[in-house]
């Protein structure tokens, strides 16, 4: 009786179970009663990443330099090429099909996480006691100067964008 289901790494064709082609190979001809499945290796710049019955291999992804893309990991017969973005740019999606500039954190915000080729700068607001007076893609919020440790007093309060201003203590006491 012809099978209705096949084992793992097999497929059903013409009422019989044939072996799937291994990753990196494509199907040339199905098996018969007398012959095994015929598979051929993928060509240069092609791949198949699963056990398959595909008659054509997939083209490796092209990392278009005009879009700011470059090869992070070269593809093999079993894996696709992985693209990333040039320095100072990051991917707009997980598929990394185009790149955008890293953003800077505005004054009042500090860098929580520096950008990479695949993720943008993550900014955070400077909490009370901290400030950032620059637009930067790597500077964290800085703590306000401690006037007391310098034997000075606060003459002007700090904000999230400015440091405190220290001054000499008033020596005249009642």
């Amino acid at each position: 009786e012809p099978p209705t289901a096949c084992r793992e790494k097999q497929y059903l064709i013409n009422s019989q179970c044939c072996s799937l082609c291994q990753p990196g190979q494509k199907l040339v001809s199905d098996c018969t009663e007398f012959t095994e499945t015929e598979c051929l290796p993928c060509g240069e710049s092609e791949f198949l990443d699963t056990w398959n019955r595909e008659t054509h291999c997939h083209q490796h992804k092209y990392c278009d330099p005009n879009l700011g893309l470059r090869v992070q990991q070269k593809g093999t017969s079993e894996t696709d090429t992985i693209c990333t973005c040039e320095e100072g740019w990051h991917c707009t999606s997980e598929a990394c099909e185009s790149c955008v500039l890293h953003r800077s954190c505005s004054p009042g915000f500090g860098v929580k996480q520096i950008a990479t080729g695949v993720s943008d700068t993550i900014c955070e607001p400077c909490p009370v006691g901290f400030f950032s007076n620059v637009s930067s893609a790597f500077e964290k919020c800085h703590p306000w100067t401690s006037c007391e440790t310098k034997d000075l007093v606060v003459q002007q309060a700090g904000t999230n964008k400015t440091d405190v201003v220290c001054g000499p203590q008033d020596r005249l006491r009642a």
């Epitope: 330099p65 040039e86 953003r103 930067s136 893609a137």
Partner: antibody, heavy 115, light 112 residues
Framework: EVQLVESGGGLIQPGGSLRLSCAVS????????VSWVRQAPGKGLEWVGI???????AYASWVKGRFTISRDNSKNTLYLQMNSLRAEDTAVYYC?????????WGQGTLVTVSS | DIVMTQSPSTLSASVGDRVTITCQAS??????LSWYQQKPGKAPKLLIY???DLASGVPSRFSGSGSGTEFTLTISSLQPDDFATYYC??????????????FGGGTKVEIK
């Protein structure tokens, strides 16, 4: 055909403002980054600034807020707004496509700043 | 800001000559170096990117080399169409959110 076409140049008085346009065809501004590059008469090339596919911008350090790059995706057009113009801003202004290099250029538009 | 020093500023050569133009960056730019050709009244045309990659449609007599701070453009056998001005261009990201695209001063290749 893939191309960039600049327009909006002309004679302008010092201190004046001017907006240049760069109409692109054959590709989308929501996919590619485009820069403005200028060239003073008989001089070399100088980068002005860039707008990325998401609308983010970066400028040359000398720009100091005088110039602003923007775009209108529906018109597939890029703009360079130039304020407080000086004689030394006299140049041919090109738009050029690319991220770390410029593989496609427009023909340029001449801006003359003179009284 | 990064400074690109290109030399020579003018070069006299004959058809068939091997021509070399150099560009020096004031700090390391890895391989972020491009070369352009410009003819009078025309826009620049990309020849080489990433220091040594030949742009599409550019004849193989043009080649680029170098990394870090020293770069070279070579024309193996100068053709009549190659008399023009050549510019190098660096890309540099400071890591602080500032971007720099700096051009060299140009090299005019003229007929000897």
């Amino acid at each position: 055909e893939v191309q960039l076409v600049e327009s909006g140049g002309g004679l302008i008085q010092p201190g004046g403002s001017l907006r240049l346009s760069c109409a692109v065809s054959g590709f989308s501004l929501s996919t590619y980054a485009v820069s403005w590059v200028r060239q003073a008469p008989g001089k070399g090339l100088e980068w002005v600034g860039i707008i990325d596919s998401g609308g983010g911008t970066a400028y040359a350090s000398w720009v100091k807020g005088r110039f602003t790059i923007s775009r209108d995706n529906s018109k597939n057009t890029l703009y360079l707004q130039m304020n407080s113009l000086r004689a030394e801003d006299t140049a041919v202004y090109y738009c050029a496509r690319g991220v770390t290099f410029f593989g496609l250029w427009g023909q340029g538009t001449l801006v003359t700043v003179s009284s | 800001d990064i400074v690109m020093t290109q030399s020579p500023s003018t070069l006299s050569a004959s058809v068939g000559d091997r021509v070399t133009i150099t560009c020096q960056a004031s700090q390391s730019i890895s391989n972020y170096l491009s070369w352009y050709q410009q003819k009078p009244g025309k826009a620049p045309k990309l020849l080489i990117y990433r220091a040594s990659d030949l742009a599409s449609g550019v004849p193989s007599r043009f080649s680029g080399s170098g990394s870090g701070t020293e770069f070279t453009l070579t024309i193996s056998s100068l053709q009549p169409d190659d008399f023009a001005t050549y510019y190098c261009q660096a890309y540099y990201y400071s890591g602080g959110g500032s971007y720099d695209y700096a051009f060299g001063g140009g090299t005019k290749v003229e007929i000897k």
